[in-house]
């Protein structure tokens, strides 16, 4: 049998937040129902999970011997403190688009972890901003976004924004 | 190492131009708002201008709105002051500094650069 | 805009005594969000400013306990408990509230008695 350590080196996890209770489960990324120390998983989920906080989680199976996978949970922030504005400028809409996360709270997270993507079309920028100009007016342009922390998504978002008519005579 | 290095500073005569740069490094320049303060010769603090993360809004106090503008190039990790129609009072230590957005904090400033305005 | 003013502008203190400092707005720095944008930095002799609180009462990381700060609407304080000689300098409070019109204290500098 292989080590529980070796077996699980390469895990990934998502994570998943409740606005409710403002609290994250971690969904351990694996096929069989594995057990998670003194973290109790169901469906090989942690639950009750506090945004910036770390939490380690022991993992082993029956499948794997000790030692077992030390898995530590880098914990996002909340995802209620960001929101997906349209910065857009009224003068300027019918050939422009300007998409903005804003940090409407603060967090003890390592801001520095934070990765902001914005996919509009098949244009790709890694910015928390972005400006698109020279548009076709009245055309419908479709953004995604998502935000990720340590290179786990923890939110994301789309906007569809259809840009103005043209000024008569343009 | 989180660093902000501002340069650029000089003695310039009234109604002369002068452009400013802050060379950030060690972070993710375009994901952080950024902002220029003063200091003057009273040992005051003024906010000068601020720059969302892309570049897309600018804010200024009156006291030098229309005279100065900030910008920031993020494939080159710089914030930009340009100062024209400078006068005596804008005679000051000048410090960029980082704001994640507007409600948050300045927490890395840079160690400042002189600007005198005289005659 | 919003004026802050400071007081005292100079704070004699012995080494070990408690020191406080106040700050006042010239109206309310409550956003319309429910929180209050008021922060508190430090600048050392030679130095440029250092945050120590942000949100009022939150103390940055790295910020020893002994500093903590309090108020609400348009009066707040900064306590240091114990003072200590690494805490000399000038201290400015500051309003993010009324975005973009971002406005500082005049300063208050600790100094030994």
């Known amino acids: 049998k292989p080590t529980c350590d070796e077996k699980y080196a390469n895990i990934t996890v998502d994570y998943l937040y409740n606005k409710e209770t403002k609290l994250f489960t971690a969904k351990l990324n694996v096929n069989e129902g594995v057990e998670c120390g003194n973290n109790t998983c169901t469906n090989n989920e942690v639950h009750n999970l506090t945004e910036c906080k770390n939490a380690s989680v022991s993992i082993s199976h029956n499948s794997c011997t000790a030692p077992d996978k030390t898995l530590i949970l880098d914990v996002p922030p909340g995802v209620e403190k960001f929101q997906l504005h349209d910065c857009t400028q009224v003068e300027k809409a019918d050939t422009t688009i300007c998409l903005k996360w804003k940090n409407i709270e603060t967090f003890t997270c390592d801001t520095q972890n934070i990765t902001y993507r914005f996919q509009c079309g098949n244009m790709i920028f890694d910015n928390k901003e972005i400006k698109l100009e020279n548009l076709e007016p009245e055309h419908e342009y479709k953004c995604d976004s998502e935000i990720l922390y340590n290179n786990h998504k923890f939110t994301n978002a789309s906007k569809i924004i259809k840009t103005d008519f043209g000024s008569p005579g343009e | 190492e989180v660093q902000l290095v501002e340069s650029g500073g000089d003695l310039v005569k009234p109604g002369g131009s002068l452009k400013l740069s802050c060379a950030a490094s060690g972070f993710a320049f375009s994901n952080y708002d950024m902002s220029w303060v003063r200091q003057t010769p009273e040992k005051r603090l003024e906010w000068v201008a601020y720059i969302s993360s892309g570049g897309v809004s600018t804010y200024y106090p009156d006291t030098v709105k229309g005279r100065f503008t900030i910008s920031r190039d993020n494939a080159k990790n710089t914030l930009y002051l340009q100062m024209s129609s400078l006068k005596s009072e804008d005679t000051a230590m000048y410090y960029c500094?980082?704001?994640?957005?507007?409600?948050?904090?300045?927490?890395?400033w840079g160690a400042g650069t002189t600007v005198t305005v005289s005659s | 805009d919003v004026l802050m003013t400071q007081t005292p502008l100079s704070l004699p203190v012995s080494l070990g005594d408690q020191a406080s400092i106040s700050c006042r707005s010239s109206q309310s720095i409550v956003h319309s969000n429910g929180n209050t944008y008021l922060e508190w930095y430090l600048q050392k002799p030679g130095q440029s400013p250092k945050l120590l609180i942000y949100k009022v009462s939150n103390r940055f990381s790295g910020v020893p306990d002994r500093f903590s700060g309090s108020g609400s609407g348009t009066d707040f304080t900064l306590k240091i408990s114990r003072v200590e000689a690494e805490d000399l300098g000038v201290y400015y409070c500051?309003?993010?509230?009324?975005?973009?019109?971002?406005?500082f204290g005049g300063g208050t500098k600790l100094e030994i008695k």
């Open positions: 500051f309003q993010g509230s009324h975005v973009p019109m971002y406005t």
């Open positions: 500094a980082r704001r994640y957005d507007v409600w948050w904090y300045f927490d890395v």
